[in-house]
Structure formats: C-alpha cells, structure tokens
Interface confidence: low
Amino acid sequence: GGGGSKHKCFRKDLEQNETLESIMSTAESEEELKRYFYYLEGSK
C-alpha cells in the first residue's frame, strides 16, 4: 500500500545520497553515512 511506496521512495533517496557521499571527500563520506544509517534505523 501507501506505506510500501513511501518506503521505496525513501530507499531510492537514500541510495542516491550514498552515491553522492562516496563521490565527495573521505571524511565527509564517513560522517554523513553514519547519519544516514542512524536515520534509516530510526525510520523502522
């Protein structure tokens, strides 16, 4: 239902964010990814 599509949308967003982060500097990649994973856990 609606929840599933929202989750799918979030995953797509997260995946692009991960790609963007890995393109940037090492330090920011690690720090930002920590925040994303925390956000993902918190959304469950």
Partner: antibody, heavy 118, light 112 residues
C-alpha cells in the same frame, strides 16, 4: 599551495579523441572527489563528470555519457578525462575542480581549451 | 534534471552601492540529510570560477564579508553589500543536491 593544473587541450576533428589531464598539488588528492566542468565560449558552466576519491564511483552528464570516461591515479595525483567521438558542441574550456566537504567545488584549475573543428 | 534560473541576467551597479542576485531551482534543494546544497561562484573576466558561498550562506575562506547568501527550498539570494571594482564578473548559482549537478545561466555584474 592548493593547485589544479589542466593540460591536454587542443584542436581535434569531429569523431576523434582527446585525453585531458589535471595535476593536483598542495592537498591530499586521494581524499577528495574530483570533477570536470566545461564552459563553451561566451556561455555558462556545464558540469561534466565526477569521480569518487577512490575511483570506485563515477557519474556523467547525459550529454557525454558513453563518450567520455573519467579516471584518476592517486599515486601520481592526476585526474583524467578521456573524450571520444568528439562533437562540435564539445568545444569548451574544460576545468577540473575539487569536490570538498559540504558538496562544493571549492578549488578550480585555470582550464584547458578544447576545439572540435574539421 | 533540476533547472536553475537567475535574475537579473545583467546588473549594472554603482561602486559602493549594494547588489542582489536571485536564483531559483525547479525543485527543492533540501536533501534528506537536512542540508541544502546551493553554492554561489564568481567568475571574473578571463578567470576560472571561484567559490564564494556554499550551503546557502557559508562564506568560503578568503571571501570578503560584503558577500552574503540567504534563502531556502527553491529561492536563494546573493547580496553584495557594497560593490567594489574587483566584483565585476559573472555570478553563478549551482546545485549539488542531485545528479546531474546544474548551474544557473549566470548574472553579469558590471559598473555603471
């Protein structure tokens, strides 16, 4: 001091290839994503491509996808842009830029001119 | 793709007077990390672009404090509090929120 110096530009016929290089100095090259941005004469800026600090992730503008490849050699502090099947619309000054913390292109080279003409 | 527009495209200003440039994006530049990846670049005649402002309002190192950035979501502004001769050039906004990264068309600032 932090510096980026592009080279490899020149005049090339349509359909031919050219390889641009960018020599980095004054910072830890292997810790930064690197970009290519171009500017046609008298026009605006167009983002071309980016490569991650480790070379494992790459992304391209649709206008160059399948024709251009981006690579880097962290042992030599060098960024490359291999341009194949060049078109008249690829004529531009090509800048390399450092992708820093906060998703910003903070340091730019002076640019190298690519002219595609028969 | 996110389309960036700027107004005005040309801005003749008087030395010592303020100048303002507007930038609008076709969709929100807020990413899920809460940051807005909007930068301003200056390109003086015959020179490469130079970073002025990142993440809407953060001045890059060495940038004079007469430059300031503001805005949110889709609408952003670059202000020069008192224009100096060295400020002549083209100013671009740029989004790095989403691939492909895109630039505004540029605003030419010159002296009246």
């Amino acid at each position: 001091q932090v510096q980026l110096v592009e080279s490899g530009g020149g005049v090339v016929q349509p359909g031919r290839s050219l390889r641009l290089s960018c020599a980095a100095s004054g910072f830890t090259f292997s810790s930064y994503g690197m970009h290519w941005v171009r500017q046609a004469p008298g026009k605006g800026l167009e983002w071309v491509a980016v490569i991650s600090y480790d070379g494992n992730n790459k992304h391209f503008a649709d206008s160059v996808k399948g024709r251009f490849t981006i690579s880097r050699d962290n042992s030599k502090n060098t960024l490359n842009l291999q341009m194949n099947s060049l078109r008249a619309e690829d004529r531009a000054v090509y800048y390399c830029a450092r992708g820093a913390s906060g998703f910003v292109l903070d340091i730019w080279g002076q640019g190298t001119m690519v002219t595609v003409s028969s | 793709d996110i389309v960036m527009t700027q107004t005005p495209l040309s801005s003749p200003v008087t030395l010592g007077q303020p100048a303002s440039i507007s930038c609008r994006s076709s969709q929100s530049l807020v990413r899920s990390d809460g940051n807005t990846y909007l930068s301003w670049l200056q390109q003086r005649p015959g020179q490469p672009p130079r970073l002025l402002i990142y993440k809407i309002s953060n001045r890059f190192s060495g940038v004079p404090d007469r430059f300031s950035g503001s805005g949110a979501g889709t609408d952003f502004t670059l202000k020069i509090s008192r224009v100096e001769a060295e400020d002549v050039g083209i100013y671009f906004c740029m989004q790095t929120t989403q691939f492909p990264f895109t630039f505004g068309p540029g605003t030419k600032v010159d002296i009246k």
